[in-house]
Structure formats: C-alpha cells, structure tokens
Amino acid sequence: SSPTSSASSFSSSAPFLASAVSAQPPLPDQCPALCECSEAARTVKCVNRNLTEVPTDLPAYVRNLFLTGNQLAVLPAGAFARRPPLAELAALNLSGSRLDEVRAGAFEHLPSLRQLDLSHNPLADLSPFAFSGSNASVSAPSPLVELILNHIVPPEDERQNRSFEGMVVAALLAGRALQGLRRLELASNHFLYLPRDVLAQLPSLRHLDLSNNSLVSLTYVSFRNLTHLESLHLEDNALKVLHNGTLAELQGLPHIRVFLDNNPWVCDCHMADMVTWLKETEVVQGKDRLTCAYPEKMRNRVLLELNSADLDCDPILPPSLQTS
C-alpha cells in the first residue's frame, strides 16, 4: 500500500484528520495495508493487527468495517472523517480494541452509520458527546439504530471517581441524538442500577439487553414509554423481586418478551404478586425455569409452583422482644 489517503480536513470538528492527506491524489478504492477488502461485499476487515490508529486510507465504498482486536486506545474527534466522507459506512465494529477513551465527535461525518459495536473495550473515559458529536442541548439526530456496548466496564482500579452507569447514560442521552435507536446492548457492565430517565428518552427501542449486570431492583425504572419494545434481557442480574408497578408496565407493552433467568429471587411474602403474575402472563420467556434463591428453605423451588401459603415473611418483632 502506498501512502495515499482519502482523509482530509474537517478542521473545525475533526482536527485529528485535518493532516491526513498525502502528496498524491487519493485512491479511494485502495485497500489499506494490514487489512482485507472486498469491494463486492463492501467490507473492510483490519482484524487482530495491533493497529494503534484507524487507517487513513479506507476505501470510499466501505459499508462494513471491522477494526476488532487492535490497540486503538483512543478515538479522537473525527476519527472516521474523510474527504470524501465514508458516506456508505453502515456497520462499524471496534470490539476488543483496547479503547479506553472515546472523545466527543468520534463518529462524526458518518451519515449512514447504523450499527456500532464498542464491546469488550475498557471505556474509562466515554465522552457525553461521543455519539451526539455536539454539546448542544438538542443535537442533530444520529443515524444509529444499533449500539452494542457489552462489557465496556473498565477494571475497578481504572475507573474514575464517578458513576460508570452515569457516564454511559450521559453518552446515551446527550442532545437526544439517539432517539432512533432500536437495539441497545449493555450486558456485562456491573451496572448496579439503571438511571430512571434513560429509557424514557430512548422511545424507539425494540431490543434492550441488560443481562449479566448487578441490577438489584427495577423499582424506579419506567418501561411505560417503550411501546415498541420487543425483547428485554434481564438474565444474570441480582433481581430479588419485581413489584406491581413494574409488572403492570411490562404487561402493558404489546410486543414484549422478557428474559429473567438466573436471578436470585427472594421467595417471601413480597413475591406473591410476581408469582401470581408469572402464572398468568405470556411475556416471560422460560418462566418455568425461574427458581428461588432465598430464603434457604425455598432454594431451587420453581416460582410457578409456589402458592401464597409458601410465601411468608418472618414477623418483625417489637424492639422489646428482640434478642441479640
């Protein structure tokens, strides 16, 4: 590959690429060194090549770009800005590329970008404007339809002094740019809670994956606005019970399928409403697999087989009768 490039100067919003132009005229259909290209499939794969930067000479025809298994570390503003722009780029996979910093405007100048996968990168520093590209209160709508953010939590010693959940949610909500998002995957991120405003501002969601987190409760989460939601993955969390409000909201979603396997359900008196609901609802997939984790006497009991007599709470003794 000769050192030509189709990158150019978007100096205001993409200073990083303002200097990515060579002396020769660009060869827009050239395949970068260390990459494999198929013009017929409109696909470029630069996989497991230890790249430290996004290639500058990506062919203009690229629709599917795989940059997985590299060592990119940081995505600056305009990391994919080119002249002419990568107008066809629809699917971008950056998973497992050791990214820990994604800056504001990193995905600007990609007008057709519908699928973005940042999974398996330790994102200690995800800018609130990574996806919106602007700090305006209302940004131009992002074309993103699928955003895959599985296992982006950094190791504990690399996390900043702020809520990781909050950082991710700020990026999802900035400028209301992701109003058209249909699939959001946030699995395996050690989320302890789901900020209450996040779902209300993603009204187009069809698929939401929150599996393998540490969610204890959905009490303050509202699903009411997600009228298009088709699948909700809550497997492998720390859920103890779903309360009436949540049950009613889920039941009211016309197309929903909910996945609840492998949660430590607490089968006491607070579980009665959920058990009743499970017996009647069709929305829970594999509901016959749900079992109690606590109390000990109820461990491994199938929720669907419980009746109200099984679900008791130990009486709370008045302080005068409590013993140490």
Epitope: S1, A18, S19, A20, N50, L51, T52, T56, E158
Partner: antibody, heavy 120, light 111 residues
C-alpha cells in the same frame, strides 16, 4: 541499542526534490510508528509527518501537506521522506523518531539528523 | 492547532539549586485516562532526548532529579538539584491531536 541514522540531506534549489532516508536498527522496526521532526537553524522543533507501523495511517503538518510523502519499507528497516516542491522555509535539520503510537505515544528515540538546505 | 507556551524563555540557575520550567497548552491536553504532554531535553549539537512522558513519568535512564507534574493546561518540569550537564534547551510537546506541537523551548544555563 536503538539506532536511527538519517541520510539524504544536502543543498537543493527551490522547487526541486529530495528524498531522506532513516535506517533503523536495535529494535523491531515493524512494531513502531515513525515520525519526521525538523528544526530550522536556531529555531525550535516542528513535527512534520507520521506513519504507522504497518503503513495504514499517514499524517502531515499543514506546512508540508501535498508536497511531502512519508513511507517505509519494513523489510529494509527504513523510513523515507520524499520532499517535493521544496521551499526556502524547508531548510532545517530533519530528524526521524520512533513512537509506540500516534496520540498515546511520544518521541522516545531520535536520530542524529540530516541537514537540508534549500537555496538558490 | 494547540499552542504550547513555555515560560520562561531562558533561565539561569546555580548549581545544586532547583530549576522550574512551565508549559501551558491553549486547551486541555488531559483526559481522565491519559495526559498527552511530554518533555524533552536538547543539548547543543545533539538531537532531543525524551525526559518525561505523560506529564509525570520518568523515561528509563533519566536521573530522578528530573520530575514532571500538572494536568489539563498547566504543566511543570522540575530539576531538583541542577547539575552542569543539565545545560540544554527543554521542550514540552502535546500529543492530544494532529498536529503535534512543541513549546518554543526554554534555555537553561548555569548562573
């Protein structure tokens, strides 16, 4: 021991061309990005160009964009800078330098430099 | 482009005394993950040499009398006890974005 040795400098007239080379030894050349940095007489340091380890990324200072081309031959452990349409203001000592990446990197090894003089 | 401004332009310090050189960037060159600021020493007739990377990390083989600090836009290079061999020009450099730019240099001399 890491060694970078530049060559190809000289006196050239404005508008003419010159090609600089940088021979690398003592490290795995193909694992490192490379830069050219220059220093005009009595002046400070100015970054000129960068090429990634596998020649997938190229970046240039505005002052040389469209005139200079950076390239490398990993089989020969050699970095190049093709300089066309030279101007008087390109007069400088040109250093090649090594880095582990563009933004997260730094210039951790330098050559002794080669002098380019553009004069009529 | 990010402008790097060093102060002072020149500095004379007695042997064994502390020398401090400042560098200011026209915008922040730090993220929560990394600080994109590095220091170099250039002795007369020689190429530059890396001293400090990412604001505060001492390059291998550099004497520990050299130290760096700072974040955001303001950075400092300190030589705790000046030695005769430290006479040189010192440059800061950012790697936040392209173009990479250097400070104008600070000339350090013996008083």
């Amino acid at each position: 021991e890491v060694q970078l040795v530049e060559s190809g400098g000289g006196v050239v007239q404005p508008g003419r061309s010159l090609r600089l080379s940088c021979a690398a030894s003592g490290f795995t050349f193909s694992n490192f990005g490379m830069h050219w940095v220059r220093q005009a007489p009595g002046k400070g340091l100015e970054w000129v160009a960068y090429i990634s380890s596998g020649s997938t990324s190229f970046y240039y200072a505005d002052t040389v964009k469209g005139r200079f081309t950076i390239s490398r031959d990993n089989s020969k452990n050699t970095l190049y800078l093709q300089m066309n349409s030279l101007r008087a203001e390109d007069t400088a000592v040109y250093y090649c330098s090594r880095t582990n990446s563009l933004l997260r990197g730094f210039f951790d090894a330098w050559g002794q430099g080669t002098t380019v003089t553009v004069s009529s | 482009d990010i402008v790097m401004t060093q102060s002072p332009d020149s500095l004379a310090v007695s042997l064994g005394e502390r020398a401090t050189i400042n560098c200011r960037a026209s915008q922040s060159v730090s993220s929560s993950s990394y600080t994109y600021l590095h220091w170099y020493q250039q002795k007369p007739g020689q190429p530059p040499k890396l001293l400090i990377y990412s604001a505060s990390n001492l390059e291998s083989g550099v004497p520990d009398r050299f130290s760096g600090s700072g974040s955001g836009t303001d950075f400092t290079l300190t030589i705790s006890s000046l030695q005769a061999e430290d006479v040189a020009v010192y440059y800061c450099q950012h790697s936040w974005e392209i173009p990479l730019t250097f400070g104008q240099g600070t000339k350090l001399e013996i008083k």
